[in-house]
């Protein structure tokens, strides 16, 4: 016998679902155990069967899922999957926000990422704060040099994707650079996209040799690439 456990916890990492009104929302809590557990759903702590919801809900027990079509503002709340068997129980909370505002390009907080000066061997964090109606797709890019040039024949910069992430609205996205070397110096860009468009801002990382005791945190002026 075994208490319930999540079989695909990586599919449950997106806790906050911020979706536009009219979209379909699907929550999944894939689980297993012995005996095979059952699943039930709560909304804001109360048993949820969708009887008061226009359009109802779809419960697919074999997929451990709850589906709501054409969500409206009254669907906002905390949805809990409760998975139980004779041995034990587990639960997980999803937060649903239904958005009614005009969806817009991601908005990046001014001054982030910030120009930074670091010493060889130190650790650096570059921050990007993104505001977006729909879940934004984030990329961290480093501007690189190819054959001695920073730009291609088309006039656009050469960039290398360092990190890709889907984050929840209003979260801070961080690029960690460990044990930096002189090669890490250069221009870094936080690029955020959603269904409306892209927004990006850049910052410079200056890396000083570790033997230089006189360095200060004065950063060069920001330069934004177009």
């Amino acid at each position: 016998q075994q208490a319930p456990y999540w079989t695909h916890p990586q599919r449950m990492e997106k806790k906050l679902h911020a979706v536009p009104a009219g979209n379909t929302v699907k929550f999944r809590c894939p689980a297993a155990g012995n005996p095979t557990p059952t699943i039930r759903w709560l909304k804001d702590g109360q048993a949820f069967h969708g009887e008061n919801r226009i359009g109802g809900i779809r419960l697919r027990h074999q997929h451990w899922s709850l589906v709501m079509e054409s969500v409206v503002p009254s669907d906002r709340g905390t949805y809990t999957c409760l998975v139980e068997n004779a041995v034990g129980s587990i639960r997980y909370n999803y937060l649903l926000d239904v958005l009614e505002r005009s969806p817009h390009r991601p908005i990046l907080q001014a001054g982030l990422p910030a120009n930074t000066t670091a010493v060889v061997g130190s650790d650096v964090e570059l921050l990007c704060k993104v505001y977006s109606d729909a879940q934004p797709h984030i990329q961290w890019l480093k501007h690189i040099v190819i054959n001695g040039s920073s730009f291609g024949a088309d006039g656009f910069p050469y960039v290398q994707v360092l990190k890709t992430a889907d984050i929840n609205s209003s979260e801070v996205e961080v690029l960690y650079l460990r044990n930096v070397s002189a090669e890490d110096a250069g221009e870094y860009t936080c690029l955020a996209g959603n269904s409306i468009g892209l927004s990006y801002q850049s910052a410079w990382l200056t890396v000083l040799p570790e033997e230089d005791p006189t360095w200060t945190a004065a950063a060069p002026e920001a330069r934004y690439t177009d």
Partner: antibody, heavy 124, light 112 residues
């Protein structure tokens, strides 16, 4: 060559349904948001709907909300617009337009590629 | 919704002469990333719109350098330095900041 090709237009009576399709080629369809824009005869351009690259987000113009549904099949490089409860004022050429992509925008981040359009006539 | 107002409604230009089209938005199109998201299109008879200018002043690939875009925040201008016969069509501005994306009413450019 980057191309968008709409199909499915035709003449339909008010209250009936029609489904438009847009076949994409020459680019990684699954990495781009996609839009529908329409143009009534002799009139200007009106944005209709957008769907995100993975289909998780959809937005609609107020004039079609609740009647039209945008969807996509990334495995077939196809964008669709299901139009229900059609009205005479929905008569227009419907254009499929490429939106923002994932990654660095080498040029405009969308609204650069338009299909030739498909004509929808709603008439009794 | 952001309203895009275009003037004039129509324009008759002598070949080789300049032309200017104005577009005003009801809200600023200057975004937090420092870019101004106004686009300009031309639509020739029986064709879909073709992109001319993006992000206020960037010419799209293949667009002749006689076309230029300028402006700031809410007031935008498309200029054709020397109009050619092939420039006839209807010109539209568009805001690409938020949904619903909105277009100006169009300016019809004709050759005298």
């Amino acid at each position: 060559e980057v191309q968008l090709l709409e199909s499915g237009g035709g003449v339909v009576q008010p209250g009936r349904s029609l489904r438009l399709s847009c076949a994409a080629s020459g680019f990684t369809f699954s990495s781009y948001a996609m839009h529908w824009v329409r143009q009534a005869p002799g009139k200007g351009l009106e944005w209709v709907a957008v769907i995100s690259y993975d289909g998780s987000n959809k937005y609609y113009a107020d004039s079609v909300k609740g009647r039209f549904t945008i969807s996509r099949d990334n495995s077939k490089n196809t964008l669709s617009l299901q139009m229900n409860s059609l009205r005479v004022e929905d008569t227009a050429i419907y254009y499929c337009v490429r939106g923002a992509g994932l990654g660095w925008p080498y040029g405009p981040d969308g609204f650069d590629i338009w299909g030739q359009g498909t004509m929808v006539t709603v008439s009794s | 919704d952001i309203v895009m107002t275009q003037t004039p409604l129509s324009l008759s230009v002598t070949p080789g002469q300049p032309a200017s089209i104005s577009c005003t938005s009801s809200r600023s199109l200057l975004h937090s990333d420092g870019k101004t998201y106004v686009y300009w299109y031309v639509q020739k008879s029986g064709q879909p719109p073709q992109l001319l200018i993006y992000e206020l002043s960037n010419r799209f690939s293949g667009v002749p350098d006689r076309f230029s875009g300028s402006g700031s925040r809410t007031d935008f201008t498309l200029k054709i330095s020397r109009v050619e016969a092939e420039d006839v069509g209807v010109y539209y501005c568009m805001q690409y900041v938020e949904a619903p994306l909105t277009f100006g009413g169009g300016t019809k450019v004709e050759i005298k």
